[in-house]
């Protein structure tokens, strides 16, 4: 289980029309459910239940985004529609280039993601918890455009801007 180095860039606009770029670094773990690869894209907050339906009514797709899913306590969802791995697969089918799970409320999900899968995803599936998860969710909850870069080695230097 290798360390995943996640760099999140958030753009904030000011009343003067200028922009400030904030870069936040956090760490997670690559799970065996996916590939140990670098990936980058715009962050999309996904509710676990949002990965249940097939969204067959949608006829447009976007590709190359990073799905962030905050898993709930197992007691709140005793009969989940999909396994955690199934949810990761569904996100990738919908165009995600990587999936990050916040497992703080559901640490059992770590074992589920690390059970050897015969058919692992070809995209990274990362899990975060604790202070790193809090940092990530604080950014996601701003409803502002945020972009993530996932790397399997530490970034050489903080990057102020990157182009997706």
């Amino acid at each position: 289980k290798e360390t995943a180095f996640v760099e999140v860039v958030l753009f904030e606009s000011s009343p003067s029309g200028d922009y400030t770029t904030y870069t936040t670094g956090l760490t997670g773990r690559f799970s065996r459910a996916g590939a140990t690869l670098s990936a980058e894209g715009e962050i999309v907050q996904m509710h676990p239940l949002g990965l249940c339906n097939n969204n067959d009514e949608e006829d447009l797709y976007e590709y190359g985004w990073v799905g962030v899913v905050k898993l709930e306590q197992p007691e709140l969802d005793p009969k989940p529609c999909l396994t955690v791995l199934g949810k990761a697969k569904r996100a990738v089918q919908r165009g995600a280039t990587a999936v990050i799970f916040d497992v703080s409320e559901n640490p059992e999900a770590i074992d589920q993601l690390n059970q050897g899968s015969e058919d692992p995803l070809k995209r990274p599936v990362v899990y975060v918890k604790g202070a790193d998860a809090i940092k990530l969710m604080n950014i996601v909850n701003k409803q502002k455009v945020a972009r993530a870069r996932i790397q399997h080695r530490p970034p050489r230097q903080p990057t102020e801007y990157f182009d997706m």
């Epitope: 922009y19 715009e42 999309v44 509710h47 339906n53 969204n55 447009l60 797709y61 919908r94 997706m164």
Partner: antibody
Framework: QVQLQQSGAELVKPGTSVRLSCKAS????????MNWIKQTTGQGLEWIGI????????NYNVRFKGKATLTVDTSSSTAFMQLSSLTPEDSAVYYC?????????????WGQGTLVTVSS | DTVLTQSPALTVSPGERVSISCRAS??????IHWYQQKPGQQPKLLIY???NLASGVPARFSGSGSGTDFTLTIDPVEADDTATYFC????????FGTGTKLELK
Amino acid sequence: QVQLQQSGAELVKPGTSVRLSCKASGYTFTHNHMNWIKQTTGQGLEWIGIINPGSGGTNYNVRFKGKATLTVDTSSSTAFMQLSSLTPEDSAVYYCARNLITIAGPFAYWGQGTLVTVSS
Amino acid sequence: DTVLTQSPALTVSPGERVSISCRASEGVSSYIHWYQQKPGQQPKLLIYKASNLASGVPARFSGSGSGTDFTLTIDPVEADDTATYFCQQSWIDHTFGTGTKLELK
């Protein structure tokens, strides 16, 4: 199919407030962000702000902070925008528009628009 | 704010090829979307992320560009294409171009 149905035209007096609605159907309301956009002949199209119906979280264009307030009622799959302290410059057509998937994605689905006229 | 500049109007004949330009004041990667708006109607998505055709949109419409210069091309133009065309960037927040009014001879 995805549909956004907006409330009817409003004629209001300066200094008052107005609340516009946008009823969503054809998809799970809490799974996609909703935006509001203003259109005038002089200023063209201006993005007002965005709301995440799942969490209620909002982000506003700095020019509309204090002017617009975005809310949702998930039980009726309806988004609302309240405009306060109205002036004639607020006269415009206001649209709700749903993102595709990402916040920075396109406005894939639009309501038909609500005309607001501010006049004494 | 990122300012998007469009030429105000174009007049072409049916059957011709027309290119509508959109220039951003700063780089926006490929985060440009194009909309068509007819009088009394809401805008309709044509192209997203610079070059992706929205569903139900005829293949006569195409988009290109990245960084600061983008183009919407209609080839061939049909009478029904009379409308105003807006570009929009979403690299940081959302801003729209002023619109290009397309008229047919």
